[in-house]
Amino acid sequence: ASNFDCCLGYTDRILHPKFIVGFTRQLANEGCDINAIIFHTKKKLSVCANPKQTWVKYIVRLLSKKVKNM
C-alpha cells in the first residue's frame, strides 16, 4: 500500500528473491509515516515490505551483495 511515494503499510506476501531486481529504503524521518523497504520486481511492481522481518533483511543483503559485485 502506498500513497504517492510513501508506503502506508506492508505486504502480507513473501516475495521470492528471484523476482526482485532492486529495492529502495523508505525512512520515517524523511517525510513518510513508516520505515519500509520497497522491493522492485521484474514486472515493474513496487512492493512495500516490513524492514524488521527476517525474509526482508535477507533479500536486502542478497541484493546489496549483487550490487557490490557488479
Epitope: H16, P17, K52, Q53, T54, Y58, I59, R61, L62
Partner: antibody, heavy 124, light 107 residues
C-alpha cells in the same frame, strides 16, 4: 521437537574441500533460516553465513564469501556447508543452528536449535 | 558490518555473586541482540533474545537489558552450573556478528 543432526568428524588435507550436512527432523525446514557458525579450538564463535532453504541463495560473512557455499535440499530437510581451499586455520567445530521463528516473523529472536557440531581437522 | 565488543573477556566470581557482562555494538542495533551460554564441548544455548526476553526454560536469575548500542547480561545470583562462556550476537543485519565472549570462572 526440532532437532538438527550433523554429519560426522572429518580429517582433510590442506587445499582440499569439506562438505558438512545438517539434517532437520521434527519440524518445518524450508521457511526457517539456517546459520552456520564455527569455533576454532579455544576460540570464540564466528558466523559464517546463513540460508533460507526456500530461497536457495546463501548470505555469507565477508571473510568466507569466496570459499564457502551454502545449499539446502528441501526434499530431505538437509542443509549443507561446503568450505574450499582448506588451511590449518580452518580446523574447528562447525555448528548449524536454526532461527527461533520462521522467515515471516521479526528478526532478532535468536537461534534456539543447534546441531551438536562437526569437528573438521585440516592436517597434512 | 557491525562489530560487537564484549567485556570483560574473563571474569572470576563466586557462587551467589551478581555478575554483569556488557556488549557494545559499533552502530545502533535497536534491540536485535541475543545472549548465549556455552559449556566446553557443547553447542551454544540461547538465554536471552530481543535484548531482554528470557528464552523458555532459562532460569529467571538471567536477565538482559539495553537498546541501541549498549547491552548487558546480568546473572543475579551465580549458581555452580552458570560457570561457562557467554556470547552476545547481533542479528539486526547481515552478516550476523558475535561478541568475543566472556569466560566466567570460579574464584
Amino acid at each position: 521437537e526440532v532437532q538438527l543432526v550433523q554429519s560426522g568428524a572429518e580429517v582433510k588435507k590442506p587445499g582440499s574441500s569439506v562438505k558438512v550436512s545438517c539434517k532437520a527432523s521434527g519440524g518445518t525446514f524450508s521457511s526457517y533460516a539456517i546459520s552456520w557458525v564455527r569455533q576454532a579450538p579455544g576460540q570464540g564463535l564466528e558466523w559464517m553465513g546463513g540460508i533460507i532453504p526456500m530461497f536457495g541463495a546463501g548470505n555469507y560473512a565477508p571473510k568466507f564469501q569466496d570459499r564457502v557455499t551454502l545449499t539446502a535440499d528441501e526434499s530431505t530437510s538437509t542443509a549443507y556447508m561446503e568450505l574450499s581451499s582448506l588451511t590449518s586455520e580452518d580446523t574447528a567445530v562447525y555448528f548449524c543452528a536454526r532461527d527461533s521463528t520462521d522467515f515471516s516473523g521479526d528478526s532478532g529472536l535468536g537461534m534456539d536449535v543447534w546441531g551438536r557440531g562437526t569437528m573438521v581437522t585440516v592436517s597434512s | 558490518d557491525i562489530q560487537m565488543t564484549q567485556s570483560p573477556s574473563f571474569l572470576s566470581a563466586s557462587v551467589g555473586d551478581r555478575v554483569t557482562i556488557t556488549c557494545r555494538a559499533s552502530q545502533g542495533i535497536n534491540n536485535y541482540l541475543a545472549w548465549y551460554q556455552q559449556k566446553p564441548g557443547r553447542a551454544p544455548k540461547l538465554l536471552i533474545y530481543a535484548a531482554s526476553s528470557l528464552q523458555s526454560g532459562v532460569p529467571s536469575r538471567f536477565s538482559g537489558s539495553g537498546s541501541g548500542t549498549d547491552f548487558t547480561l546480568t546473572i543475579s545470583s551465580l549458581q555452580p552450573e552458570d560457570f561457562a562462556t557467554y556470547y552476545c550476537l547481533q542479528d539486526s543485519d547481515y552478516p550476523l556478528t558475535f561478541g568475543g565472549g566472556t569466560k566466567l570462572e570460579i574464584k
